[in-house]
Interface confidence: low
């Protein structure tokens, strides 16, 4: 397993639909073909897996049905986003990129973007 | 509805070729992100991974067959061709292909198998 | 080669019972694990994948967990179509191994 550099932004706030959106770019050593790319949410000491996807260079990345994420790809860079968060979603956002194909298999893992996601203010009930 | 289906030679002498094919329906290999993989099993014994190729004609090979493994698509006839090179009676296995979809990594539609028996 | 283990490898059940058949990986795989289901003469039919999803058209009976080395297939109630053998595959990187399987018998 060889090292590489991923680069992704320090903060980005979501929008108020809770939507986020960052683009998560990587160093290769070498023209792989097959890229995974998986988003980890490290929040008080604890790492979970967000959503993942694999994809051939050029060609849309498929998550799973049920993913909470979308992205696309263009060349060394992939832009992510993640949908659905709400405040308690709050957190740094880790990109884990994997060179998956071919040979040798290279590892890099991102610094993470902190992901600020404030709910929105309910409206107040109107007296009109 | 995915179908696959593998034909070739049920017996095969030492040091001969194999030449399987899996002729499949139900999808094609010039759609982005198909793949059709190939997989054996000796009698009695666990599944094995050979190979894999994908739409674009990205091959993947199990690295301890790879020197006697090829892989091909013919596209326009929905089918994949396999030739295992040098077969030896350990070889006797029942081989299936199998669909896959990339970013799925599972095999999800399979072939019903060929037996193939090595011996002299 | 990521190696993977399988216990245990022979299980004798009745029906009703619990079942559960313990994957292991040699490294780290995260949940890119798949589980298969075999029946005699027939191919392998994919039942679960991605360590806990259920494929399309399998029982809720069966169910995956897991994550990293460590995985598991449960069968909640076992069922006289359920005697089969049962084989993990790992999907994390080439080549994707197989587990030597697990074989439930009738008690």
């Known amino acids: 397993c060889k090292a590489m550099h991923v680069a992704q932004p320090a903060v980005v706030l979501a929008s108020s639909r809770g939507i986020a959106s960052f683009v998560c770019e990587y160093a290769s050593p070498g023209k792989a073909t097959e890229v995974r790319v998986t988003v980890l949410r490290q929040a008080d000491s604890q790492v979970t897996e967000v959503c993942a996807a694999t994809y051939m260079m050029g060609n849309e990345l498929t998550f799973l049905d049920d993913s909470i994420c979308t992205g696309t790809s263009s060349g060394n860079q992939v832009n992510l986003t993640i949908q659905g968060l709400r405040a308690m979603d709050t957190g740094l956002y880790i990109c884990k990129v994997e060179l998956m194909y071919p040979p040798p298999y290279y590892l890099g893992i991102g610094n993470g973007t902190q992901i600020y996601v404030i709910d929105p203010e309910p409206c107040p009930d109107s007296d009109f | 509805q995915i179908t696959l289906k593998e034909s070739g030679p049920t017996l095969v002498k030492p040091t001969q070729t194999l030449t399987l094919t899996c002729t499949f329906s139900?999808?094609?290999?010039?759609?982005?992100?198909?793949?059709v993989g190939w997989i054996r099993q000796p009698p009695g014994v666990a599944l094995e991974w050979l190979a894999l190729?994908?739409?674009?004609?990205?091959?993947r090979f199990s690295p301890s067959l790879k020197s006697r493994l090829t892989i091909t698509k013919d596209t326009s006839k929905n089918q994949v061709v396999l030739t295992m090179t040098n077969m030896d009676p350990v070889d006797t296995a029942t081989y299936y292909c199998?669909?896959?979809?990339?970013?799925?990594?599972?095999?999800?539609?399979w072939g019903q198998g060929t037996l193939v028996t090595v011996s002299s | 080669d990521i190696q993977l283990t399988q216990s245990p490898s022979f299980l004798s059940a009745s029906v009703g019972d619990r079942v559960t058949i313990t994957c292991w990986a040699s490294?780290?795989?995260?949940?890119?694990l798949a589980w298969y289901q075999q029946k005699p003469g027939k191919a392998p039919k994919l039942l679960i994948y991605?360590?806990?999803t259920l494929q399309s058209g399998v029982p809720s009976r069966f169910s995956g967990s897991g994550s990293g080395t460590e995985f598991t297939l449960t069968i909640s109630s076992l069922q006289p179509e359920d005697f089969a053998t049962y084989y993990c595959?790992?999907?994390?990187?080439?080549?994707?191994?197989f587990g030597p399987g697990t074989k439930v018998d009738i008690k």
């Open positions: 199998a669909h896959r979809r990339l970013g799925l990594y599972y095999f999800d539609y």
């Open positions: 139900g999808f094609s290999l010039s759609t982005s992100g198909v793949g």
């Open positions: 190729i994908y739409w674009n004609d990205d091959k």
């Open positions: 490294q780290g795989i995260s949940s890119y």
């Open positions: 991605a360590a806990s």
């Open positions: 595959q790992q999907v994390h990187i080439y080549p994707f191994t």
